[in-house]
């Protein structure tokens, strides 16, 4: 195989378009990301260039290994689209577009509890709301560190609600909720709310 490729050979599949990818597609503002531009042809010395729209961001030479471009996504317009150009001598091919999804992280949610007390049961309604963060937000409710609800998806800035009925317990119960959106590995928790045991008239959240 020729080390130097002429443009005639570009008409064949000897020099296909490069591939542009990133391990993270969903990012938050201020996040550092790495973009990888690679080519199937491992024997050629290739010059890789990265573009966001028509703005040239950088150039690297490589042979057999992907070119790595490190960026910081600080503004909405930096979400893309990005393209990578692979060039050998005067011949070039561009990758498909790659765009990031910029997501604002969720802030710590607030858990509110409302209880209706009967002689035998407590009817508990849990409300959880994160006032900031890109929608949709998935909320999960916990009792004593164990999930007691499925993930509840909210596409509006309204609290997630979960109802449960419990026999009047003899022990304290601790509740909290988790808020999570599309940002990977990024979840926040409410402050725990402790529900006291039923000894005496101690039900601060109860509707009398």
């Amino acid at each position: 195989r020729k080390a130097v490729l002429d443009c005639e050979a570009m008409k064949t599949n000897e020099f296909p378009s490069p591939c542009l990818d990133s391990k993270t597609k969903v990012v938050m503002k201020g996040q550092n990301v790495s973009m990888f531009c690679s080519h199937k042809n491992k024997s050629l010395q290739i010059t890789y260039s990265l573009f966001r729209r028509k703005t040239h961001l950088g150039t690297q030479d490589g042979k057999g290994e992907p070119a790595i471009f490190n960026l910081s996504i600080t503004e909405a317009h930096e979400s893309g689209p990005y393209k990578c150009k692979a060039q050998v001598t005067s011949c070039s091919k561009y990758s498909r577009d790659f765009s990031f999804t910029i997501v604002d992280p969720v802030t710590s949610p607030v858990l509110n509890i409302m209880v209706i007390q009967t002689e035998t049961d407590r009817h508990i309604t849990l409300h959880c709301l994160s006032v900031n963060g890109s929608l949709p937000i998935n909320y999960t409710f916990f009792e004593n560190h164990v999930a007691i609800s499925p993930a509840i998806s909210k596409y509006d800035r309204e609290p997630a609600e979960f109802n449960l009925t419990k026999k009047n317990p003899g022990e304290e119960e601790e509740y909290r909720c988790e808020a999570k959106n599309r940002l990977p590995n990024y979840a926040t928790y409410s402050h725990p709310v402790t529900m006291p045991s039923t000894g005496g008239d101690s039900c601060p959240f109860c509707l009398k």
Partner: antibody
Framework: EVQLVESGGGLVQPGGSLRLSCAAS?????????MCWVRQAPGKCLEWIGC?????????YYASWAKGRFTISRDNSKNTVYLQMNSLRAEDTAVYYC??????????????WGQGTLVTVSS | DIQMTQSPSSLSASVGDRVTITCQSS????????LAWYQQKPGKAPKLLIY???TLASGVPSRFSGSGSGTDFTLTISSLQPEDFATYYC????????????FGCGTKVTVL
Amino acid sequence: EVQLVESGGGLVQPGGSLRLSCAASGIDFSSYYDMCWVRQAPGKCLEWIGCIYTGSVGELYYASWAKGRFTISRDNSKNTVYLQMNSLRAEDTAVYYCARRGSGVDDYYFNLWGQGTLVTVSS
Amino acid sequence: DIQMTQSPSSLSASVGDRVTITCQSSQSVDNNNWLAWYQQKPGKAPKLLIYDASTLASGVPSRFSGSGSGTDFTLTISSLQPEDFATYYCQGTYYTTDWWNSFGCGTKVTVL
């Protein structure tokens, strides 16, 4: 109807300045395009001058020969782009076209053109 | 600079004729196919006919076709119609340290 309308052309003396306007109707600049200027001297080739991106940052792209004397700007609230031309010479005499293209790196072709405005540089 | 050379600079033909115009760039255009063709009638703005060397722009009749890659490109009108008498331009694009959008100087198609 989607259209581009250029204005501001006319007779100017060598060394003088002129600002051309391109008003876009039926186009929402917030949809993000490159708004460009291309000129055509009488009986000569078309010649690309430069472009401005209508998105928030407004990246500019110029032909290397145009840098310095020619400045492109925009007013998104008026859906208008401008071409400021300084230190004009006789060879700048041409019909100046406003043209639109997509904002992606592969949107290099001009898919909408205005009717052009004539600039004559002469003493 | 990238130079786009069109040939012929003018040609005369009759309605129904097959017309071929060539465009040669001084170096390979970007992506091997970033070349567009435009039609311009006197006193009018250019109109996009073909982009990516061979893709027909919206609303362009199928008698127009484009081919080529790298440095050599062709515009073909399979059966010339009265409304096709005009000047045709090619435009090639590539990036070095700046963007280049270079036009050929045109091929004028007139009635024989």
